[in-house]
Amino acid sequence: DAHKSEVAHRFKDLGEENFKALVLIAFAQYLQQCPFEDHVKLVNEVTEFAKTCVADESAENCDKSLHTLFGDKLCTVATLRETYGEMADCCAKQEPERNECFLQHKDDNPNLPRLVRPEVDVMCTAFHDNEETFLKKYLYEIARRHPYFYAPELLFFAKRYKAAFTECCQAADKAACLLPKLDELRDEGKASSAKQRLKCASLQKFGERAFKAWAVARLSQRFPKAEFAEVSKLVTDLTKVHTECCHGDLLECADDRADLAKYICENQDSISSKLKECCEKPLLEKSHCIAEVENDEMPADLPSLAADFVESKDVCKNYAEAKDVFLGMFLYEYARRHPDYSVVLLLRLAKTYETTLEKCCAAADPHECYAKVFDEFKPLVEEPQNLIKQNCELFEQLGEYKFQNALLVRYTKKVPQVSTPTLVEVSRNLGKVGSKCCKHPEAKRMPCAEDYLSVVLNQLCVLHEKTPVSDRVTKCCTESLVNRRPCFSALEVDETYVPKEFNAETFTFHADICTLSEKERQIKKQTALVELVKHKPKATKEQLKAVMDDFAAFVEKCCKADDKETCFAEEGKKLVAASQAALGL
């Protein structure tokens, strides 16, 4: 339905508070380097303009598209060329090319200082002094560091952030109350950002069809009692929501997400029995709850899939009549029967089925040709099952830190050209699959593990795309979205890699390591491990373990010493020499 003024329409639908928050997120995700105050000024100007349009939709410029209005506003920033360089050239373009240009300049790894958490009292004072500014700053800092963060979900995080401060700043022990909550929000936020980044990559790099296939599989697992037509409607609406958010259309996205939550709750009887609690919550909590809702129970007496998709003489006729609908039905039927499979596995099975039909429906005897298609699924199912079994056994044997180290070595040997910070970040996240998923029973392990790995490997892909250094990474990232994990798993040691020159500075440590948190200390050690492998890719597990054990002992010893700095200098030299000898450097 067309509105005379789009900006007025969204302002009225969303309300002033959400409107302002979403515009701030949008601007911070586009202009990631701009100071907070500049963004607040721009948001206030847009909000005032929106109010004039609400008062009179025929007022000047009120009929302009949101992209035009927002783009024009962003292009008024005085320091655009100095701060962003070639991004300033976007402003010479017309819509829709201008918005596409801004999108292309979003930076997944912006050069921004790490967010340092102030003392609790300092935070509580700032919160009480100006709650609105404090919360806006949260939105701004998260949005600029995570330019694809799912905006309506960021509103939910901000609501929880506010609730944490409201509660804890009145508590007897503020820190004990607040810090665990902030840690939880930080970890959940990173996970949410990474999950959304995969959705946007799926849409932007592989197209709407790929995203829709993912959504059919996931929603069919989650809502196995829903009819195919119902799932298809939800998929269409969900695709629109994520296309908008990934395209920077955050007001439309938030509005449509609210409409979708409303529809789901109004029709929960034909969707899922698990939605009741979610649907009793306020809007932001409701949408979040629906997105995370557990899978409904599978209907009893689901018939054999083979009847319609293998044994039926009408397979090729049905396929030819409406290929995507028929494949969608196949994916829906398979997924609702298999909550124990990862979404990416279900998509691989659907792709295999499609390939078989393409070949067989052109054959002399189609039925004879596709009769054994389900047999082709067996190795595809067994591969992730075996991989997860092996890796969970390794995780249980080593624990998270050493499991991460095993993955660090494995991935550095596969793609040694990738930057050390990226290898550390990605391998640490890959290693978290153990504590996240291995505790689950068999039936939940694969969807947990493989779909999580897809999210983490997408981080590698988007970081690598910014500065491509490895053809192997590019190949695994671009060839097939659903085969990324098997592609990386299949990579062996890169025999073409020329070992990095040894640099003693890389292995020089100082007393500041002693004051770091356990996590930061681990990262330092893991950085050293990656560098070791880059110097000596052929080093054995045993050699690397010996060096790392020596390194851990060295850090422990020097952190206990009276003169820490001297200890690090002297013992450090010895350690480097011993390590070089041990590795034959």
């Epitope: 018939p303 009847a307 039926s312 003489k313």
Partner: antibody, heavy 121, light 110 residues
């Protein structure tokens, strides 16, 4: 006892609609394709269409557009929705269980007793 | 698609061997997707033969079917009193939309 029972038949005016039901007992409908066949008084059997276990529907060319087959596995029932009825649709309507699950083999091994539909003004 | 049965009616005596034929205007699916039914007045049809020659459960062995492609035969080796009825053939074709019945052969006592 394994059986199919049709219901919903009766007299209807030309241009009217009727929804026939076929309730299964003693077995689950979800394991076989279910078809509808009709027989005008003293005439041949006439295939109307079939619904597969997964809900794919197939209709005789003359039935397409006016007749719709659906199923509700939770109720163990199959339906035949008939619209724009004409005098020549007067017949006994049978539901039947096909040997196959995903298509029509023409081999219906379990039949209901039928329900009479009369279209007249 | 047409299914033509012949004869349309037939009189015979108990103990006789009876043959009914069915011809389709195009080949049935897999050359064998043809069924035979028996129907008595006021009753639904009863499946006798499927896949051209396979005997349905509970059907006496005096009934047999043969044929392939477009031409099929139902044979009753030795007529029994309960066999007097109308017999229909039905063919399954490459599309489930095309399933078709013949118009029947009425078997009466001579």
């Amino acid at each position: 006892e394994v059986q199919l029972v049709e219901s919903g038949g009766g007299r209807v005016q030309p241009g009217g609609s009727l929804r026939l039901s076929c309730a299964a007992s003693g077995f689950s409908l979800s394991s076989n394709a279910m078809g509808w066949v009709r027989q005008a008084p003293g005439k041949c059997l006439e295939y109307i269409g079939i619904i597969s276990v997964g809900g794919f529907t197939y209709y005789a060319s003359w039935a397409k557009g006016r007749f719709t087959i659906s199923r509700d596995n939770s109720k163990n029932t199959v339906y035949l929705q008939m619209n724009s009825l004409r005098a020549e649709d007067t017949a006994t309507y049978f539901c039947a269980r096909d040997r196959h699950g995903g298509d029509s083999s023409g081999a219906f091994y379990l039949w209901g007793q039928g329900t009479q539909v009369t279209v007249s003004s | 698609i047409q299914m033509t049965q012949s004869p349309s009616s037939l009189s015979a005596s108990v103990g006789d061997r009876v043959t009914i034929t069915c011809q389709s205007s195009e080949s049935v699916y897999s050359n064998n997707q043809l069924s035979w039914y028996q129907q008595k007045p006021g009753q639904p049809p009863k499946l006798l033969i499927y896949d051209a020659s396979d005997l349905a459960s509970g059907v006496p062995s005096r009934f047999s079917g043969s044929g392939s492609g477009t031409d099929f035969t139902l044979t009753i080796s030795s007529l029994q009193p309960e066999d007097f009825a109308t017999y229909y053939c039905a063919g399954g074709f490459s599309s489930s939309s095309d399933t078709a019945f013949g118009c029947g052969t009425k078997l009466t006592v001579l």
